[in-house]
Each structure stands twice: as structure tokens, then as C-alpha cells.
Interface confidence: low
């Protein structure tokens, strides 16, 4: 470990000089010190903080033959391509024994054309909608005055007279370019040119015009689109199952949406091929030659219930004396809603029709009058939802039941060769 110098005696005999110049300059700062005994490692500080990744070299030369004699140590810090981040106060620091020594400071400064800290960025804005652009530049030398330009035309009579760091634009009706000039005593620097693309405003008042079990008719009010006419609007619909979690402003649907395009005008669209009695979320965006508007918020809608599309399946009807036992299964065809129950009708050859509401049961025992004297008795069954009755089954004749015989089953719906749905096995 370093033995250190005599108390209170600074080891520094040469301190960092000053460097001032334009960006890109290369320069070197040096510290020289004389110590007794093993030379210490020289650390470089910039503004009091150690530079961990400094491009520094250290040269050590003994002044005598004895290890305990004095040494001259020269540390050189190279600054390549001077940048704003390099500016500040530079010092060298060494630890000797129980003391800490800091060199006198040298300063690195920057002076030249204005340097942009922030430039206007390309962006899209809705037509006639206010927005702000930012531009920030600094020297040295200060002051730096800004001049904004729109489509290459200055927005003020002279630098520093108009808006400075932030330009407020009350709205645009056509795609425009913006840039800013930074002026100081050394000259002028021009920022990048930002293109502000004017898109249509978000459509408003998306609403339902009419509803049917498998289709919805929707309409909306288009927003302003500047000088660019709307070319079309796009409507998205997505199933909104309970677990889906679409929020009012959620930007993307959690599953692939059903997308339809509408020619405009009119600002209206019929969405077909939907599931009955199903909640959806819909949204709309309109497009001009400049691009699409933002989407509206998701609007929750629901298709109404329909009636079942087919009759109950596998109806069997058997008779035993004055009783008839009728059994059936739920329709295979879509219910188009919530099944509320079944209606059953039976009729003899010369007797009036009897209509019964069975509820959600799938079997019923009928008490027949006249101990079987009613001839050619037939039974029909239909399923119903809140929207009404589905189609009735074909009439099923009542068959006499003989012990030991299986109950006859009347297959009223022909099985498709390939199942329409593939159900999992539990």
C-alpha cells in the first residue's frame, strides 16, 4: 500500500488544464504528481464523480534507485470527439496513506453552433385537433433562439420572437412539415423536418340500428378528415365472453376479430353470420388516403335470442293401457338462445289436440281417457326459447308396449354422414 506523503502536503505538482472547443474536438488532460514510495493509482473525477470507464493512461518514473525514493507519475486522460456529456470540471484523485488528495480543477467546455437536445418528431394527428411540437437546443455560446417553420415558411418575423421550446398548433386540415432553426452567436443549425400526417378524426356515436338473431345493423357519425375524403370505414366485432375482459378503451381485442369494410357514405353496415343470443363488442375506424383514424371505444352489443332451429331428437312414444310414456332428447340443431322448455301436443284420429308445456323435463307420462279407446294417437314435441317455439317434430304414433320388448324409437332427423360438431369425450 502507498506509504503516503508528509502530512498536509499535496502530491500534485501539475494539474489539468482547460479545453474549450467545438463538438468533435480531441484533447488530452494531464495530472502530474510526486510521491514518496510506491506510486498510487490516479483516478479521474468529472464534476466530483469518478469516471469508471475513463480513457486514461498512467506513466510512472522513479527519481532514484530505491523503491522508497520519490516517483513522478503522469496520468493522461484523452477526450476523443468532444461531446456535451464530456463538459465539466475535471480533477485527479489519489489516496495516500490516511489522506485523500484532489488536484486543482481543469475545465472542459463546449462552444460552437447550437446543438439540438430535442427535435420535432414525425407524428400523426387527427384533423382539426390541437397538438404540440418540441424543439430544444443549447450552446454554448448562449443564448440560443429558435425559429419554427411550417412547410418551410417561418412562423415568426425573427428568431426568438415566436414560440420557442414548444410550438402549439391549433389543428391541421392537411399533412404538413415542421422544422426549427436554432440561432446563436456562432451561426444557425436546422433541425430535422418532421412530417405531421393528418388522419381522420375518430368516428363518433357508434350505435345499433336494428338487431336480429344472426345480424346487427350499426351506424356511426364520421369525424372530420381535413382535405382528404374518407375512402372506407372498418368495423370489428369480437365475441365478448365473460373471461375476455375488454375494457372500454382497451386498444386490442384478445382474439381475432370479425372485420368488415363499409363503403361510405352511408355510415352504416349490416353485420351478418353472427351467433344468436351472444354478446359482442364492436368498434369502428374510418380511413382516408392518409391512413386510418383511431378506433372508437369498444361498444358492447348483443344479438337477440332466436327460436330453436330444429325439433327435439329421438322421440319415443309407447302406450300401456291408459298411460302413454313419451321421451325425447334436446334438439341437435342450434337453440339460438336459452332453452326454456318443451311443448308437447297429442291428438287422436277423432279427438281434439291437447297442448302441454312440459318445462325442461325430457319425458312425460300421459293419462289417456277411455282406457285406450282413442285410436291412431300421435305425439309432436317442440323446444322453445324466449323468442318462441322451434319447429315441431313430425307426428310420432303411439305404439303398444309389450313386456320384454324395447321401446320403439322414432328417428326423425336423419344423421349427417359427418357430424357437424365434434364434441369432446368426458
Amino acid at each position: 500500500a502507498p506509504r503516503g506523503t508528509q502530512a498536509e502536503e499535496s502530491p500534485f505538482v501539475g494539474n489539468p488544464g482547460n479545453i474549450t472547443g467545438a463538438r468533435g474536438l480531441t484533447g488530452t488532460l494531464r495530472c502530474q504528481l510526486q510521491v514518496q514510495g510506491e506510486p498510487p493509482e490516479v483516478h479521474w473525477l468529472r464534476d466530483g464523480q469518478i469516471l469508471e470507464l475513463a480513457d486514461s493512461t498512467q506513466t510512472q518514473v522513479p527519481l532514484g534507485e530505491d523503491e522508497q525514493d520519490d516517483w513522478i507519475v503522469v496520468s493522461q486522460l484523452r477526450i476523443t470527439s468532444l461531446q456535451l456529456s464530456d463538459t465539466g470540471q475535471y480533477q485527479c484523485l489519489v489516496f495516500l496513506g490516511h489522506q485523500t488528495f484532489v488536484s486543482q480543477p481543469g475545465y472542459v467546455g463546449l462552444e460552437g453552433l447550437p446543438y439540438f437536445l430535442e427535435e420535432p418528431e414525425d407524428r400523426t394527428v387527427a384533423a382539426n385537433t390541437p397538438f404540440n411540437l418540441s424543439c430544444q437546443a443549447q450552446g454554448p455560446p448562449e443564448p440560443v433562439d429558435l425559429l419554427w417553420l411550417q412547410d418551410a415558411v417561418p412562423l415568426a418575423t425573427a428568431p426568438g420572437h415566436g414560440p420557442q421550446r414548444s410550438l402549439h398548433v391549433p389543428g391541421l386540415n392537411k399533412t404538413s412539415s415542421f422544422s426549427c432553426e436554432a440561432h446563436n452567436a456562432k451561426g444557425v443549425t436546422t433541425s430535422r423536418t418532421a412530417t405531421i400526417t393528418v388522419l381522420p378524426q375518430q368516428p363518433r356515436n357508434l350505435h345499433l340500428v336494428s338487431r336480429q338473431p344472426t345480424e346487427l345493423e350499426v351506424a356511426w357519425t364520421p369525424g372530420l378528415s381535413g382535405i382528404y375524403p374518407l375512402t372506407h370505414c372498418t368495423l370489428q366485432a369480437v365475441l365478448s365472453d365473460d373471461g375476455m375482459g375488454i375494457q372500454a378503451g382497451e386498444p386490442d381485442p384478445p382474439e381475432e376479430p370479425l372485420t368488415s369494410q363499409a363503403s361510405v357514405p352511408p355510415h352504416q353496415l349490416r353485420l351478418g353470420s353472427l351467433h344468436p343470443h351472444t354478446p359482442y363488442h364492436i368498434r369502428v375506424a374510418c380511413t382516408s388516403s392518409q391512413g386510418p383514424s383511431s378506433w372508437t371505444h369498444w361498444l358492447p352489443v348483443e344479438t337477440p335470442e332466436g327460436v330453436p332451429l330444429g325439433p327435439p331428437e329421438n322421440i319415443s312414444a309407447t302406450r300401456n293401457g291408459s298411460q302413454a310414456f313419451v321421451h325425447w332428447q334436446e334438439p341437435r340443431a342450434p337453440l339460438q338462445g336459452t332453452l326454456l322448455g318443451y311443448r308437447l301436443a297429442y291428438q287422436g284420429q277423432d279427438t281434439p289436440e291437447v297442448l302441454m308445456d312440459i318445462g325442461l323435463r325430457q319425458e312425460v307420462t300421459l293419462e289417456l281417457q277411455g282406457d285406450g279407446s282413442v285410436s291412431n294417437l300421435t305425439v309432436c314435441v317442440a323446444a322453445y326459447t324466449a323468442a318462441g317455439d322451434g319447429p315441431w317434430s313430425l307426428p310420432v304414433p303411439l305404439e303398444a308396449w309389450r313386456p320384454g320388448q324395447a321401446q320403439p324409437v322414432h328417428q326423425l332427423v336423419k344423421e349427417p354422414s359427418t357430424p357437424a360438431f365434434s364434441w369432446p369425450w368426458w
Partner: antibody, heavy 120, light 107 residues
Framework: EVQLVQSGAEVKKPGATVKISCKVS????????MNWIRQPPGKGLEWIGL????????SYNQKFKGRVTISADKSISTAYLQWSSLKASDTAMYYC?????????????WGQGTLVTVSS | DIQMTQSPSSLSASVGDRVTITCKAS??????VAWYQQKPGQAPRLLIY???TRHTGVPSRFSGSGSGTEFTLTISSLQPDDFATYYC?????????FGQGTKVEIK
């Protein structure tokens, strides 16, 4: 905003040990040094020592060496001053102070002070 | 250790007066001297460092000068808020040392 908040006043008997804390916020705790200074009632300022929290390196005033320990806990941005074998003459206001960026030996932000009273 | 000798130890002055406080180092400390202001019941406040650089937010009526061993703090026009005790400090090498203080009182 740089803030240095010190622990509360202490009353100790001669020979005892006291440990006071200084919690900092508003700047990088490890990027600077923390100095400790004391001021006996009605008297001037006396430098005790410093610590560089990034590496735990310390420098002490030889006058107090052996009785003083300066430490830091980077995880909670807190510096500590521990003083043992207290004497009545150690009664003073003890300050922590942040080392200035242009010199570690400059104190640009100070804590509110912790009064340590040593009395039998 | 470096000794910092401050004078005067106290002075009386009126609002608007020009006030000068001096500090002498026992050895060459280059320009590594700072000045602090302390009011009763408060922690010291940094005014000047590197002999002549004003700290952030310090009014321009405070100025410092000197190098080597002799240093001066000047208050060009004393204000009511300036009545306090002033300390010099060398920030050249450890152990850091302070002057004994100068109390500026209202005449």
C-alpha cells in the same frame, strides 16, 4: 430535492457509545461522499471524517481516530456515525453533510443536526 | 494539519454596509477555500467555494477572493438576512479544517 434527515437527539453517560444515522434522498447516494462535522455548544465547526458509500472508503480526523467509526448502508441510502468512549467534551451538535460535486471536501447540503449530550 | 485563522472574531455593522472577513491558511491551499453562513439553530449553508465561486442560489452581494494562504469574503451591501456567523474552510486536503468563525452583529 436533496434531503439529509438525521436521527433524533441522544443523551448518554460518559464512557457510553452512540450511533447516529443520516438518511439521504434526492441524489445518488453512492456517487458522492458523506462528511460528518460536529459543533460543541457556542463553538465552531470541527470535521470528523468522511465516507465514500460506493466503496466504503473512509478518511478520519486523526484527533478522533480510534473512537469514531463511519459506515454506510447503500441499500437504504443511510450513513452512520458511531462514537465510543464518550466524554462530556463530546457534547455537541453532530451534522452529516453531502460532499459537493466539485470537491468531495465541500459540504453543499447538510442534515438538520443531531444533538448528543454526554452527562453523568 | 492546516490551520485556518479567521478575523475578526466578531464585528458590528449596519444594513447597507460593506463587510469584509478574512481567513489565513497556515500553508498554501491554492484556491481551495469555502465560506459558510450559519444562523442560530440552523445547519451551516455553503456560500462560496474554490475561493470565488458562488454556490447555487447565493445572492451576488456575496463574493470571495484570494489564493495561496490569504482569503476574503465580502458582503457588498449588508442585508437584514445577513446577520449570522460566517466560517471559512479549506477543502484542499484532509483533515478538513474550519476557521473559528466571525459573528456579524447589528450595530
Amino acid at each position: 430535492e436533496v434531503q439529509l434527515v438525521q436521527s433524533g437527539a441522544e443523551v448518554k453517560k460518559p464512557g457510553a457509545t452512540v450511533k447516529i444515522s443520516c438518511k439521504v434522498s434526492g441524489y445518488s447516494f453512492t456517487g458522492h461522499t458523506m462528511n460528518w462535522i460536529r459543533q460543541p455548544p457556542g463553538k465552531g465547526l470541527e470535521w470528523i471524517g468522511l465516507i465514500k458509500p460506493s466503496n466504503g472508503g473512509t478518511s478520519y480526523n486523526q484527533k478522533f481516530k480510534g473512537r469514531v467509526t463511519i459506515s454506510a448502508d447503500k441499500s437504504i441510502s443511510t450513513a452512520y456515525l458511531q462514537w465510543s468512549s464518550l466524554k462530556a467534551s463530546d457534547t455537541a451538535m453532530y451534522y452529516c453533510a453531502h460532499g459537493h460535486y466539485e470537491s468531495y471536501f465541500l459540504m453543499d447540503y447538510w442534515g438538520q443536526g443531531t444533538l448528543v449530550t454526554v452527562s453523568s | 494539519d492546516i490551520q485556518m485563522t479567521q478575523s475578526p472574531s466578531s464585528l458590528s455593522a449596519s444594513v447597507g454596509d460593506r463587510v469584509t472577513i478574512t481567513c489565513k491558511a497556515s500553508q498554501d491551499v491554492s484556491s481551495a477555500v469555502a465560506w459558510y453562513q450559519q444562523k442560530p439553530g440552523q445547519a451551516p449553508r455553503l456560500l462560496i467555494y474554490w475561493a470565488s465561486t458562488r454556490h447555487t442560489g447565493v445572492p451576488s452581494r456575496f463574493s470571495g477572493s484570494g489564493s495561496g494562504t490569504e482569503f476574503t469574503l465580502t458582503i457588498s451591501s449588508l442585508q437584514p438576512d445577513d446577520f449570522a456567523t460566517y466560517y471559512c474552510q479549506e477543502h484542499f486536503s484532509t483533515p478538513l479544517t474550519f476557521g473559528q468563525g466571525t459573528k456579524v452583529e447589528i450595530k
